[in-house]
């Protein structure tokens, strides 16, 4: 399981305000079992953007169906982007734990920049 890598292939993504942003993330293994979470920023002050296990994230949808067997695509689409969404987004694999899941491995991050809405 030490072989699992979290791949964020895009170093940066640029999106026009009002559009949707797709942030790509794949894992290289099904092991260990546990959910993916997405954060904006790093460190203690990071902001949770999406949690596969629990929570309500109305602007976020997953690109692939996470319940399907052998799925290792954890890319997300964030709708109605605004300048406030700019930042670096990290896809983070968690390992099933008891009582709480434990952070296992992070992707390298994708910087989202927001262009002005075309006039």
């Amino acid at each position: 399981e030490e072989g699992l890598q979290v791949i964020q292939p895009d170093k940066s993504v640029s999106v026009a305000a009002g559009e949707s942003a797709i942030l790509h993330c794949t894992a290289t293994s099904l092991i260990p079992v546990g959910p993916i979470q997405w954060f904006r920023g790093a460190g203690p002050g990071r902001e949770l953007i999406y949690n596969q296990k629990e929570g309500h994230f109305p602007r976020v949808t997953t690109v692939s169906d996470l319940t399907k067997r052998n799925n290792m695509d954890f890319s997300i689409r964030i709708g109605n982007i605004t300048p406030a969404d700019a930042g670096t987004y990290y896809c983070v694999k968690f390992r099933k734990g008891s009582p709480d899941d434990v952070e296992f491995k992070s992707g390298a991050g994708t910087e989202l920049s927001v262009r002005a809405k075309p006039s």
Epitope: L30, I31, V33, G34, N51, Q52, K53, E54, G55, D65, L66, T67, K68, R69, N70, N71, K96
Partner: antibody, heavy 119, light 110 residues
Framework: QVQLVQSGAEVKKPGASVKVSCKAS????????INWVRQAPGQGLEWIAM????????HYNQIFKDRATLTTDTSTSTAYMELRSLRSDDTAVYYC????????????WGRGTLVTVSS | DIVLTQSPDSLAVSLGERATINCRAS??????????IFWYQQKPGQPPKLLIY???NRDSGVPDRFSGSGSGTDFTLTISSLQAEDVAVYYC????????FGQGTKLEIK
């Protein structure tokens, strides 16, 4: 944390139907498969079927395909297993179990519901 | 359908000794680079508990005296040093296709 709370014991007559419920909490219900497994007194485990609450995709053990129906109510995060045309050899503890890795395995289990079929 | 056959049906082992339970599949359960075998422990009056997933990976909180091995059709659950709390029935399960369970192995203390 993940909890699966099942409905109470049932006593049914041969030929009747039973509907067992399984209320999930501590996670996003639509992101993980629910399995149903039964265990007759003093016997081993027998897989019945599984359901993906996100789209109601189901897979059934051929043995139960004509008599069992799985459903979910996403508004209450509850899964149901109905078994029809009950026979005495359907007397068993019926378990629901959640698949945390989409591996078609059973990571978290309910406590079980005893269904007794007797005339 | 893939049939899983466990051996032995029952086993008595002294405390501190090694316990070995086997699970044989009627055809290979290896697919996409994984062996789709799982091991569960069930104590009386309780639901089963997942011990090992994908043949050799310990589930969260499972003591490291439990290990799983094998590939293809032959799999083994090993308890390296039996403790009193390990008395239970152990089941293998596959999910190469739709899930089925082995018949179970009852483990007791000698």
């Amino acid at each position: 944390q993940v909890q699966l709370v099942q409905s109470g014991a049932e006593v049914k007559k041969p030929g009747a139907s039973v509907k067992v419920s399984c209320k999930a909490s501590g996670y996003t219900f639509t992101n993980y498969w629910i399995n149903w497994v039964r265990q007759a007194p003093g016997q081993g485990l027998e897989w019945i079927a599984m359901i993906d609450p996100s789209d109601s995709e189901t897979h059934y053990n051929q043995i139960f395909k004509d008599r069992a129906t799985l459903t979910t109510d996403t508004s209450t995060s509850t899964a149901y297993m109905e078994l029809r045309s009950l026979r005495s050899d359907d007397t068993a503890v019926y378990y629901c179990a959640m698949d945390y890795g989409s591996l078609y395995a059973m990571d978290y289990w309910g406590r079980g519901t005893l269904v007794t079929v007797s005339s | 359908d893939i049939v899983l056959t466990q051996s032995p049906d029952s086993l008595a082992v002294s405390l501190g000794e090694r316990a070995t339970i086997n699970c044989r599949a009627s055809q290979s359960v290896r697919s996409s680079g994984y062996n789709w075998i799982f091991w569960y422990q069930q104590k009386p009056g309780q639901p089963p508990k997942l011990l090992i997933y994908l043949a050799s990976n310990r589930d969260s909180g499972v003591p490291d005296r439990f290990s799983g091995s094998g590939s293809g059709t032959d799999f083994t659950l090993t308890i390296s040093s039996l403790q009193a709390e390990d008395v239970a029935v152990y089941y293998c399960q596959h999910s190469r296709e739709l899930p089925t369970f082995g018949q179970g192995t009852k483990l007791e203390i000698k």
